[in-house]
């Protein structure tokens, strides 16, 4: 009897270190996957972070898109009409350009030295903006908003002058306090010579190789066929 | 106060990639240009990369043109530098750094720099 | 681009010294010029700012000064926190050049 006994308690024995093993075995393995399963959850949620960032700037885009999409329409149905209408008057300005009096102004997001900024406006069949009125300096500044840009006014040659000739004499004049100051400092030999737009709107004359935004201008009285 | 928190650094391959972010606190992000400034070891500063405070305009080092890309969120706060090709000169501390205006003028807060290392 | 030269490369000088350090420029840059101290395994400080503006926080024994080609960092009297490299940088146009790099050291 105790014999049997004690076989069978050796038998549970084995069982229950049989089952111990297996047991740690599964924690083991289940601790390992839980590891892992960690990680890949981690690695899910950068993953779907870096996702949601690339679907935000995607939107945005979009967005910005659709709004081009519409404005260029507007300009297009603009076109088609002055075709049809054979007529020798140019209402409308290019696409990307905005309209105002009798010009077509195109506004720079990056930023160039005022010689760059002339060359690329005369590329446009245009020029840095000449500014004429208190209204068209209020147009202009609502635009450009509070960053430094290039204008269509330097003395590089002498006196101050409008690049498509304007008088500056009797013409419209924004500078700031005590400006210009044409200030031969710089090392560059001359003065200045260029003047910009600075965060109030008020004109400035600085040195023309500072990568400031810039504004092109064409007059829009003559259709050019754009 | 004004704090700018580079990371992303590490060791990489050449050849392979690698993405720098910059935590930006303490001021208002979204008015402010931003650069990326590096330091080979035992080197001198080098500028890397600028954006300007909306984005619209970039620039970038010769000798990083058309490998790093400078990016921003303004909704984040957060400035990037994502580094493409990456060869072992490009090994150096990056720093990011605030520009005093909207892009084009001096940098007057700088962060602490992430390590960032090519090596085969 | 534009080429930055600081002179001396390293300094010694003693606590108390008045210490003058001289950035060339290859070309005229106007006042924008900022300059620049950094201490070892630290992030660079800016210290000024078109030539001659003192950021804020930045104590008045640094001054700058010059235009156009020429420009000078002058500590009036140097104190031991102020041992250091100091960086000038032009930002007049993109590429942003920084100088070599002037190594201020205890005599």
């Known amino acids: 009897q105790n014999s049997k006994l004690q076989e069978e308690l050796q038998a549970l024995r084995e069982t229950f270190s049989n089952l111990t093993a297996s047991t740690d075995a599964k924690v083991k393995t289940l601790s390992m996957q839980g590891g892992n399963v960690g990680r890949k959850m981690k690695s899910l949620e950068s993953q779907l972070e870096k996702q949601q960032q690339d679907l935000s700037e995607d939107h945005s885009s979009l967005l910005l898109h659709v709004k081009q999409f519409v404005s260029d329409l507007r300009s297009l149905s603009c076109q088609m009409a002055v075709l049809q209408g054979n007529g020798s008057e140019r209402t409308c300005c290019p696409v990307n350009w905005v309209g105002y009096e009798g010009s077509c102004y195109w506004f720079s997001r990056s930023g160039k030295p005022w010689p760059e900024a002339e060359k690329y406006c005369q590329l446009e069949n245009a020029h840095l903006v000449v500014v004429g009125s208190w209204e068209e300096q209020k147009f202009i500044q609502h635009h450009v908003g509070p960053v430094n840009s290039w204008i269509g006014l330097t003395d590089q040659s002498g006196p101050w002058k409008w690049v498509d000739g304007t008088d500056y004499e009797s013409g419209f004049k924004n500078w700031r306090p005590e400006q210009p100051d044409d200030w031969y400092g710089h090392g560059l030999g001359g003065g200045e010579d260029c003047a910009h737009f600075t965060e109030d709107g008020g004109w400035n004359d600085d040195i023309c190789q500072r990568p400031y935004r810039w504004v092109c201008e064409t007059q829009r009285d003559r259709d050019s066929g754009s | 106060q004004v704090q700018l928190v580079e990371s992303g650094g590490g060791v990489v391959q050449p050849g392979r990639s690698l993405r720098l972010s910059c935590a930006a606190s303490g001021f208002t992000f979204s008015t402010y240009g931003m650069h990326w400034v590096r330091q080979a070891p035992g080197k001198g500063l080098e500028w890397v990369a600028v954006i300007w405070y909306d984005g619209s305009n970039k620039n970038y080092a010769d000798s990083v043109k058309g490998r790093f890309t400078i990016s921003r969120d303004n909704s984040k706060n957060t400035l990037y530098l994502q580094m493409n090709s990456l060869r072992a000169e490009d090994t150096a501390v990056y720093y990011c750094?605030?520009?005093?205006?909207?892009?084009?003028?001096?940098?007057?807060?700088w962060g602490q720099g992430t390590t960032v290392t090519v090596s085969s | 681009d534009i080429q930055m030269t600081q002179s001396p490369s390293s300094l010694s000088a003693s606590v108390g010294d008045r210490v003058t350090i001289t950035c060339r420029t290859s070309q005229g840059i106007g006042n924008y010029l900022a300059w620049f101290q950094q201490k070892p395994g630290k992030a660079p400080k800016s210290l000024l700012y078109?030539?001659?503006s003192l950021q804020s926080g930045v104590p008045s024994k640094f001054s700058g000064s010059g235009s156009g080609t020429d420009f000078t960092l002058t500590i009036s009297s140097l104190q031991p926190e102020d041992f250091a490299t100091y960086y000038c940088?032009?930002?007049?146009?993109?590429?942003?050049?920084f100088g070599g790099g002037t190594k201020v050291e205890i005599k």
């Open positions: 750094a605030r520009d005093q205006g909207v892009g084009y003028d001096g940098l007057d807060v």
């Open positions: 940088q032009q930002y007049m146009t993109y590429p942003l050049t």
């Open positions: 078109k030539a001659s």
